[in-house]
Amino acid sequence: LQDPCSNCPAGTFCDNNRNQICSPCPPNSFSSAGGQRTCDICRQCKGVFRTRKECSSTSNAECDCTPGFHCLGAGCSMCEQDCKQGQELTKKGCKDCCFGTFNDQKRGICRPWTNCSLDGKSVLVNGTKERDVVCGPSPADLSPGASSVTPPAPAREPGHSPQ
């Protein structure tokens, strides 16, 4: 036997108090799928949260964060404080990146500068709290007699057109 509630569309609920007829979701609630026996409470976007999308009878509200804060978690469940570039957020607030680390965003943690020597390269531009180091050519490439001319592009095989 088919469940009579399965006929209730999104935006309604199957009302047990009224012979299982489909009743519209009350204000401040929604059902995003059919066959629901209750409607879910709409999320409120207040305080540090702002409404990005209003709640409707078939979909929940969506929030984002007020300026100076950014979303964290599924569906922007939390708002975390922005920091400046060159800082990271700690339990005590925004703190400058330690020497040898950088953060080029308003969120996230300070990350170590790239170690150019691991790739056999030299440091072309020093790192700062806000920017990573820029690695240059390997020291061998900079030794006397090393050509600084860009090598020619490899020759194409005959009969092949450019990609």
Partner: antibody
Framework: QVQLQESGPGLVKPSETLSLTCTVS????????WSWIRQPPGKCLEWIGY???????NYNPSLKSRVNISVDTSQNQFSLKLNSLTAADTAVYYC????????????WGQGTTVTVSS | QSVLTQPPSASGTPGQRVTISCSGS????????VNWYQQFPGTAPKLLIY???QRPSGVPDRFSGSKSGTSASLAISGLQSEDEADYYC???????????FGCGTKLTVLG
């Protein structure tokens, strides 16, 4: 379950600053609003202000010039400072957790009585 | 002076149904859900109803809430002597970006 406990002086002199702390136990301070509410003897509940765990604050306009709320997530505490006290600030002061989905104050401290008198 | 308006007192006899009203404006009740709190003398308020009509676990189904326009009401059916307390309505106010309370209704259970 989550419990809140207010602490601070019971008696403060006029013109001085009241400092109260609310300690959150049995749960995290993250992802909620933390509010201060007061109730003068025989009178209404009055919202003082709130702080979101990540530092966002808002205050009752009638008290804004005198109030500061701060949070210490490492200690699971938040604090109230109210300056330039008068006898009208005599009240029971409550801290409360405000849910960040439906915004009901679902957990309250037991309250601390503050008397402003010389 | 509270932003939300409640009657200062209400009363009923055991078994009766009583309602407590709460009136606001478009910036609070008109645009936001209403919460209700119960407070016994010398204790902190307790959340009784949230989001207009939702009961936290442990709250008896004798308590119900509703909202229409810029007004809300709390209904208590099958009144019991232990329901004698103060009841406060509260709603977020968009102009404050914070909550506002009613001044409370003292419920007396007669007899």
């Amino acid at each position: 379950q989550v419990q809140l406990q207010e602490s601070g002086p019971g008696l403060v002199k006029p013109s001085e600053t009241l400092s109260l702390t609310c300690t959150v136990s049995g749960g995290s301070i993250s992802s909620y609003y933390w509010s201060w509410i007061r109730q003068p003897p025989g009178k209404c509940l009055e919202w003082i202000g709130y702080i979101y765990y990540s530092g966002y604050t808002n205050y009752n306009p009638s008290l804004k010039s005198r109030v500061n709320i701060s949070v210490d997530t490492s200690q699971n505490q938040f604090s109230l400072k109210l300056n330039s006290l008068t006898a009208a600030d005599t009240a029971v002061y409550y801290c409360a957790r405000t849910h960040s989905y439906y915004y009901g104050m679902d957990v309250w401290g037991q309250g601390t009585t503050v008397t402003v008198s010389s | 002076q509270s932003v939300l308006t409640q009657p200062p007192s209400a009363s009923g006899t055991p078994g009766q149904r009583v309602t407590i009203s709460c009136s606001g404006s478009s910036s609070n009740i008109g645009n936001n859900p209403v919460n209700w709190y119960q407070q016994f003398p010398g204790t902190a308020p307790k959340l009784l109803i949230y989001s207009n009509n939702q009961r936290p676990s442990g709250v008896p189904d004798r308590f119900s809430g509703s909202k229409s326009g810029t007004s809300a009401s709390l209904a208590i059916s099958g009144l019991q002597s232990e329901d004698e307390a103060d009841y406060y309505c509260e709603a977020w106010d968009d102009s404050l970006n914070g909550p506002v309370f009613g001044c409370g209704t003292k419920l007396t259970v007669l007899g």
